[in-house]
């Protein structure tokens, strides 16, 4: 008997009600191997979730989230609110990054701005909240009689170095 | 099967009250911290509160602080959003959902919506 369930193909289910027959999948359930007691029940993308592909017989939906949210774990499990870009998500909605802090990106957290001088740099272009410092040449490298091909460009951004 | 229910909608005067109400079945709902979000006619979805597991920490949208309240009873498996002080700009479609697993430890992240409830604020 084993081996007639074995012969169902995906998109069916082994149907122990009519003598092992092989029957298709209910509508919004599937099967995406051969040999299966039961369908899955589709997952559906609803709320927050917008489908990306649509369930057949042989494989689930995918979801994908909506504008101004994007995927968080396998299978685009979750959907994490999008902030702009020089915020972070907190427990109180989208905030400010910190003076010092930047993100670049809808999502994650602010991080500091890089040290130039741990690096023997100085600050090219101040950092903002959007946008992390550039750093430059060393001090000594500009210093009096140094060999330098161009001079330090002026900070061409509001903001200020994290020194 | 894992569900929210909304309940609690309809239409109300400026200055009015409404409460909201999200019965949840087919999970352990005391595990998750639960969130209220909602759609305005023709605008984007909008978080509005979330409230921790056991109720210990409630965050609000900044234009609803002071004047929504979020709330749980676990014992009956639901979330509450009592909204006082209602404006025209609170109209939308009111939406409850489940934070995933390592919701506000490591991300905001929500798995599991409503089908939603419509608040109309209107005289």
């Known amino acids: 008997l084993q081996d007639l369930c074995s012969n169902c193909p995906a998109g069916t289910f082994c149907d122990n009600n009519r003598s092992q027959i092989c029957s298709p999948c209910p509508p919004n359930s599937f099967s995406s191997a051969g040999g299966q007691r039961t369908c899955d029940i589709c997952r559906q993308c609803k709320g927050v979730f917008k489908t990306r592909k649509e369930c057949s017989s042989t494989s689930n939906a995918e979801c994908d989230c909506i504008s101004g949210y994007h995927c968080l774990g396998a299978e685009c499990s979750m959907c994490e609110q999008d902030c702009k870009q020089g915020q972070e998500l907190t427990k109180k909605g989208c905030k400010d990054c910190c003076f010092g802090t930047f993100n670049d990106q809808k999502r994650g957290i602010c991080r500091p701005w890089t040290n130039c001088s741990l690096d023997g740099k100085s600050v090219l272009v101040n950092g903002t909240k959007e946008r992390d410092v550039v750093c430059g040449p060393s001090p000594a490298d500009l210093s009096p009689g140094a060999s330098s091909a161009t001079p330090p460009a002026p900070a061409r951004e509001p903001g200020h170095s994290p020194q | 099967e894992v569900q929210l229910v909304e309940s609690g909608g309809g239409l109300v005067q400026p200055g009015g009250s409404l409460r909201l109400s999200c019965a949840a079945s087919g999970f352990t709902f005391s595990s998750h911290w639960m969130t209220w979000f909602r759609q305005a006619p023709g605008k984007g979805l909008e978080w509005v509160a979330h409230?921790?597991?056991?109720?210990?920490?409630?965050y609000y949208e900044d234009s609803v602080e002071g004047r929504f309240t979020v709330s749980r009873d676990n014992a009956k498996n639901s979330v509450y959003l009592q909204m006082n002080s209602l404006r025209a700009e609170d109209t939308a479609v009111y939406y409850c959902a489940r934070g995933g697993d390592g919701y506000s430890d490591s991300h905001f992240g929500v798995d599991v919506w409503g089908q939603g409830t419509t608040v109309t604020v209107s005289s």
């Open positions: 409230i921790k597991e056991d109720g210990s920490e409630k």
